[in-house]
Interface confidence: low
């Protein structure tokens, strides 16, 4: 019967070359000789000269390597005519599918990939994913089916296993608990992409995961007590700086400071604000303090942050103890 | 390999203004920030401010607020500082400088090789 | 504005000595220091930052220390590269300041 089931040519074939394929044969060759050829790219027309045909045998030849990367599958017509050149077959369609080879390495995407996560998150969380492209077939096999995996961690603080990767999807997680921007605020990670769902040639990259900040340090009083001396009636007046640390990132809204009078200013004597760049605690007295009618103020102050806590921290509290200075005031008659 | 590429040398006139480019190349310009620092001739270096490209948001010193505007075009990667009224004090080297994001934490890792103002009439 | 003081303002060190140079700062700045070195017609390069922390590339030799408000730069064994001009600079708040310059000098 004239016809052709597809053929299946590994590429990068050793050869010897021509090697014979398949045969082209028509039952018309009874009593008369049979002429064969094959047309279309690959054949007649660009890439020329891939294929050709006996043209007595009919035996179709492959001239040379395939590669599956540049052409996946030939698509050629065979055909058969009589010495005096009149066709005694229909055109017949001869499929070439070229099979793959694990001739390519898997590449990534990029040399560096950069991601980031909040400090303090659960495990679970993704970071980011990576990608790795392998030219090889990932369909009808392994070749370019691309396993990826963490080859290393630096720092390997709190320990070497805080992070993960799906073996498949390249999505990086967190597994481990004890992310803290404080100590450790970037991580490098080198990781592997390994073809053959993870039995071939690997590649490297890095992956940098960025912790960002959360706010998981309190503001600390230091140091906690204060004492101070104020004249009677100036208002406006610089009490006293406070200071605090924060270990968050400086000059974000978790380390900005925002203070609080909780006790001692019955009458509304004083105020405090924070100062942008040093953030420390700026009391000043938002009216006049009578001397004769209290010489002596103490001041129960807490911080905070401009942003809530992320999780139950205590906050701290500053004692201010002031004194109020007499003056030598006009008599009243 | 990242780099930093600045424009070239400029000579100005006094009262004129003055735009200087640098291009980065080789990491993730939106996401880090860029700084300008000014050197006088046979002095020290002076921190003028800062752009991150993902959003715009500039941070300058007080010492330049006028005088120093700072721009990026994230589509080229490049970052620019405009200086205007220009003195004779604003004769100096300009450097760029890239540092990582968050905060403040990162020191300026990657410099450009600096861009010469002289202001003369 | 923080204030930073960079000690000595010149030093003259010979191939394969030790020297350290100093910066002190009016407020705390815990561990954010930074330490270039110029050398004449080049940009800055950063050797170290966050105090004591190798920037990519630079030799061992270098080592950084210091927190709060007392920081120091120390190079081991000098090298013929190692000569020009050293500064310090506040990467903790603003505006980011630099230390005046030591300039180390082949005597």
């Known amino acids: 019967e004239w016809v052709m089931p597809p053929i299946f040519v590994p590429e990068n074939g050793k050869g010897p070359f021509p090697q014979r394929l398949n045969q082209l044969k028509s039952n018309k060759d009874r009593g008369t000789k049979i002429f064969y050829s094959i047309t279309g790219p690959g054949a007649d027309s660009p890439p020329e000269g891939v294929f050709a045909v006996e043209k007595e045998t009919g035996w179709l030849l492959l001239n040379k390597p395939l590669d599956r990367e540049e052409i996946a599958k030939y698509e050629l017509f065979g055909h058969a005519v009589s010495e005096n050149g009149a066709s005694v077959e229909d055109p017949m369609n001869i499929s070439i599918i070229v099979t793959d080879q694990n001739d390519h390495k898997p590449k990534f995407t990029q040399d560096t990939f950069r991601g980031s996560v909040l400090e303090g998150v659960l495990p679970g969380t993704s970071v980011m994913q990576v990608t790795a492209t392998d030219e090889d077939d990932a369909i009808y096999t392994y070749n370019g089916v691309v396993a990826y995996s963490i080859h290393s961690q630096e720092p390997k603080d709190p320990h070497d296993l805080m992070f993960t990767i799906h073996r498949s999807t390249g999505t990086i997680s967190v597994i481990s608990s004890g992310l803290d921007r404080e100590k450790v605020p970037e991580y490098t990670l080198t990781i592997q992409a390994t073809d053959m769902d993870g039995d071939g040639s690997t590649t490297t990259a890095v992956a940098v995961v960025e912790i960002l900040d959360a706010n998981d340090n309190a503001p600390m009083f230091d140091p906690q007590k204060y004492e101070a001396h104020v004249p009677e009636n100036a208002v406006g007046h610089e009490v006293q700086r406070l200071t605090v640390t924060d270990l968050d990132a400086p000059n974000s809204p978790a380390w900005r400071a925002t203070y609080l009078i909780m006790g001692g200013d019955d009458g509304d004597h004083f105020t405090i604000t924070t100062h942008p760049e040093s953030n420390q605690g700026i009391l000043t007295t938002r009216k006049g303090l009578d001397f004769e009618a209290k010489n002596q103020h103490t001041l129960y102050v807490e911080v905070t942050n401009e942003a809530p806590f992320v999780l139950k921290l205590p906050t701290s509290t500053a004692t201010i103890v002031v004194h109020v200075e007499d003056v030598n005031e006009a008599p009243v008659f | 390999v990242q780099l930093v590429e600045q424009s070239g040398a400029e000579l100005v006139k006094p009262g004129a203004s003055v735009k200087i480019s640098c291009k980065a190349s080789?990491?993730?310009?939106?996401?880090?920030?860029m700084n300008w620092v000014k050197q006088r001739p046979g002095k020290g270096l002076e921190w003028i401010g800062r752009i991150y490209p993902g959003d715009g948001e500039t941070k300058y010193n007080g010492k330049f607020k006028g005088k120093a505007t700072l721009t990026a075009d994230k589509s080229s990667s490049t970052a620019y500082m405009q200086l205007s009224t220009l003195t004779s004090e604003d004769s100096a080297v300009y450097f760029c400088a890239r540092q990582r994001d968050y905060g403040a934490l990162y020191a300026m890792d990657y410099w450009g090789q600096g861009t010469s103002v002289t202001v003369s009439s | 504005e923080l204030q930073m003081t960079q000690s000595p303002a010149s030093l003259s060190a010979s191939v394969g000595e030790t020297v350290t140079i100093t910066c002190r700062l009016s407020?705390?700045?815990?561990?954010?220091l930074a330490w270039y070195r110029q050398k004449e017609g080049e940009s800055p390069q950063l050797l170290v930052y966050n105090s004591k922390t190798l920037a990519e590339g630079v030799p061992s030799r270098f080592s950084g220390s210091g927190s709060g408000t007392q920081f120091s730069l120390k190079i081991n064994s000098l090298q013929p590269e190692d000569f020009g001009n050293y500064y310090c600079?506040?990467?903790?708040?603003?505006?980011?300041?630099f230390g005046a310059g030591t300039k180390l000098e082949i005597k």
């Open positions: 407020e705390n700045i815990y561990s954010y």
């Open positions: 080789g990491y993730a310009f939106s996401s880090s920030w």
């Open positions: 600079q506040n990467h903790y708040g603003f505006p980011f300041t």
